[in-house]
């Protein structure tokens, strides 16, 4: 019969013959022959292969470097690489999460619209009229101005986006 020019999925062509690829978590030891199957071996400690493959060496698991703010989210297996994430208060600088940066804080006059996660930074928004933030924070939202009326008080000093209103007693009519 004619030697194949293409092979099925999870196979590869070598010496005019279709051989089975090694499954994830295993590396190639020897190609198949007319009489023998492909020989594969499991990846060892600290190694992985995450696809059907014909690699003769497994890849090393990545290291979550605490000096870069990283910690282990999930350790590697023979079929998966280690997944790193950032320490509390930090987030990844890229999708691959190779290093971390400190979450940004929202300055006075701005509040947190969305709290940062291990993979996304803080999203800030300006405090609209009627709201304020007087701190630099990665957690605080804009707070509504105090309602003087509900306390039977009057506004003595108007609020801004950075300060609350100042309430005071109502002027009493003298008898």
């Amino acid at each position: 019969p004619e030697p194949p020019t293409a092979c099925r999925e999870k196979q590869y062509l070598i010496n005019s013959q279709c051989c089975s690829l090694c499954q994830p978590g295993q590396k190639l030891v020897s190609d198949c022959t007319e009489f023998t199957e492909t020989e594969c071996l499991p990846c060892g400690e600290s190694e992985f292969l995450d696809t059907w493959n014909r690699e003769t060496h497994c890849h090393q698991h990545k290291y979550c470097d605490p000096n870069l703010g990283l910690r282990v989210q999930q350790k590697g297996t023979s079929e998966t690489d280690t997944i790193c994430t950032c320490e509390e208060g930090w987030h990844c600088t890229s999708e691959a999460c190779e290093s971390c940066v400190l979450h940004r804080s929202c300055s006075p006059g701005f509040g947190v619209k969305q709290i940062a996660t291990g993979v996304s930074d803080t999203i800030c928004e300006p405090c609209p009229v009627g709201f304020f933030s007087n701190v630099s924070s990665a957690f605080e939202k804009c707070h509504p101005w105090t309602s003087c009326e509900t306390k039977d008080l009057v506004v003595q000093q108007a609020g801004t986006n950075k300060t609350d209103v100042v309430c005071g007693p109502q002027d009493r009519l003298r008898a």
Epitope: L41, P42, C43, G44, E45, S46, E47, H57, C58, Q60, H61, Y63, C64, D65, P66, R71, V72, K75, G76, T77, T82
Partner: antibody
């Protein structure tokens, strides 16, 4: 900082069993593979096996199957090595050594070792 | 299982002398780790993934190799280097250690 505290020395009779412990601090054992290594007096190092505390799966050297059982308890952050049907050949220091994924290199930390003496 | 053969089993070296310890694997391995052990103490990782020095290991140490042949070299022997060195492969289960090389100061 990271530390591994192993249980104290054991003097046991032939045929008996013993269970050694290795308690980790400074990291979560679920982020490591916990290995056990044997060293007989004046001899070299022998790998017994390891456990993945995240799922309880173990791998071990076939020559220790039936002799050594590795378990772990994530609530106490502890790995265990149980040795059964003890003989004089089992007299050795037993070390635990995690392959911890928050460390730059594997086997960066070792316990102080537990001496098991098998004698009647 | 992969057998690691270390040579020599025992050797002595004078201060300043170059020392090479070899580790031969019965089958090809992806990498080799080296451990140092002194009497009465736990082993210490010394060289990892063939050629990387662990923290605190002097730069006079180096590691190299591939396939079935690996080595640890000390460019200039010092008294504190006297110890037993073990190679270990982790690329195939079961993990295996070499029998060790005892390095003494002459």
């Amino acid at each position: 900082q990271i530390q591994l505290l192993q249980s104290g020395a054991e003097l046991v009779k032939p045929g008996a069993s013993v269970k050694l412990s290795c308690t980790a601090s400074g990291f979560n054992i679920k982020d490591a593979y916990m290995h056990w290594v044997k060293q007989r007096p004046e001899q070299g190092l022998e790998w017994i096996g390891r456990i993945d505390p995240a799922n309880g799966y173990t791998k071990s050297d076939p020559k220790f199957q039936g002799k050594a059982t590795i378990t772990s308890d994530t609530s106490s952050n502890t790995a265990y090595l149980q040795l059964s049907s003890l003989t004089s050949e089992d007299t050795a220091v037993y070390y635990c050594a995690p392959n911890y994924y928050g460390s730059r290199y594997p086997f960066a930390y070792w316990g102080q070792g537990t001496l098991v003496t098998v004698s009647s | 299982q992969i057998v690691l053969t270390q040579s020599p089993a025992i050797m002595s070296a004078s201060p300043g002398e170059k020392v090479t310890i070899t580790c031969s694997a019965s089958s090809s391995v992806s990498y080799m780790h080296w451990f140092q052990q002194k009497p009465g103490t736990s082993p210490k990782i010394w060289i990892y993934f063939t050629s990387n020095l662990a923290s605190g290991v002097p730069a006079r140490f180096s590691g190299s190799g591939s396939g079935t042949s690996y080595s640890l070299t000390i460019s200039r022997m010092e008294a504190e280097d006297a110890a037993t060195y073990y190679c270990q492969q982790g690329s195939t289960y079961p993990l295996t250690f070499g029998a060790g090389t005892k390095l003494e100061l002459k």
